[in-house]
């Protein structure tokens, strides 16, 4: 019997220092480019090898970015979100939402779920 897939959602503040090649990640999303149905949020789609985000290690592909330097990313056009990152300065504070997939065991075996993701 297959277990139910649940998600554990956590938030984290990540402070990055812009490196020689920038912050080192890609984004998708925005009001004009919804990546998730009924969600115009901004999501991390690529972490570039040896970039600032990869070297820091906390930002993950699939994370939702809620704010940049305290500025909310809700209801932004995709390019406006891109521009916000590009103009964010040397020290960049990201509020991010991680969504960790948790595989729960079959009914009657609660508590045996293994996080995977």
């Amino acid at each position: 019997m297959n277990g139910r897939v649940d998600y554990l959602v956590t938030e984290e503040e990540i402070n990055l220092t812009r490196g020689p090649s920038g912050l080192g990640f890609n984004i998708v999303g925005g009001t004009d480019q919804q990546y998730v149905s009924n969600d115009s949020g901004i999501y991390v789609s690529r972490i570039k090898e040896n970039g600032a985000a990869a070297l820091d290690g906390r930002l993950q592909e699939g994370d939702k970015i809620l704010s940049v330097n305290g500025q909310d990313l809700k209801n932004l056009l995709h390019q406006d979100a891109v521009d916000l990152f590009r103009n964010a300065g040397y020290a960049v504070s990201l509020r991010v939402q991680h969504r960790l997939q948790v595989q729960n065991g079959p009914i009657g075996h609660r508590g045996e779920g293994d996080p995977s993701g």
Epitope: S21, G22, L23, G24, F25, N26, I27, V28, G29, Y35, Y43, V44, S45, R46, I47, E49, E61, G62, H78, Q79, V82, F85, R86
Partner: nanobody
Framework: EVQLVESGGGLVQAGGSLRLSCAAS????????MGWFRQRPGKERDVVAT????????YYLDSVKGRFTISRDNAKNTVFLQMNSLKPEDTAVYYC??????????????????????WGQGTQVTVS
């Protein structure tokens, strides 16, 4: 981490057709740029065709234009390479590749056009 598994290679006569498939797993397929590359005997690996994450932008190597078609099926987490009018010089190991799509937050020109992060094991195509 993205896992890529190619299939559909084989031996075909000149003028024939093959359809390569690449199944992706490990993360949402719909946000991935996908590509097909090939390595001919004694040569470096070359890009053959690419398709972006939204499916609205494709690239083809000049020598395969009009003969090869790249497409994607997001519902099946699969990218395809339809190869028609095959020639002996198309003989190679064909590799599927993936990377996260979207926009770089750093610069419009930051991404290497054919710089991919994840690779399959390859499938042999031999045209006699």
């Amino acid at each position: 981490e993205v896992q890529l598994v190619e299939s559909g290679g084989g031996l075909v006569q000149a003028g024939g057709s093959l359809r390569l498939s690449c199944a992706a797993s490990g993360r949402p397929f719909s946000s991935l740029d996908m590509g097909w590359f090939r390595q001919r005997p004694g040569k470096e690996r070359d890009v053959v065709a690419t398709i972006n994450w939204t499916g609205d932008s494709t690239y083809y190597l000049d020598s395969v234009k009009g003969r090869f078609t790249i497409s994607r099926d997001n519902a099946k987490n699969t990218v395809f390479l339809q190869m028609n009018s095959l020639k002996p010089e198309d003989t190679a190991v064909y590799y599927c590749a993936a990377r996260g799509g979207g926009s770089s937050v750093d610069s419009e020109y930051d991404d290497g056009e054919f710089e991919y992060d994840y690779w399959g094991q390859g499938t042999q195509v031999t045209v006699s």
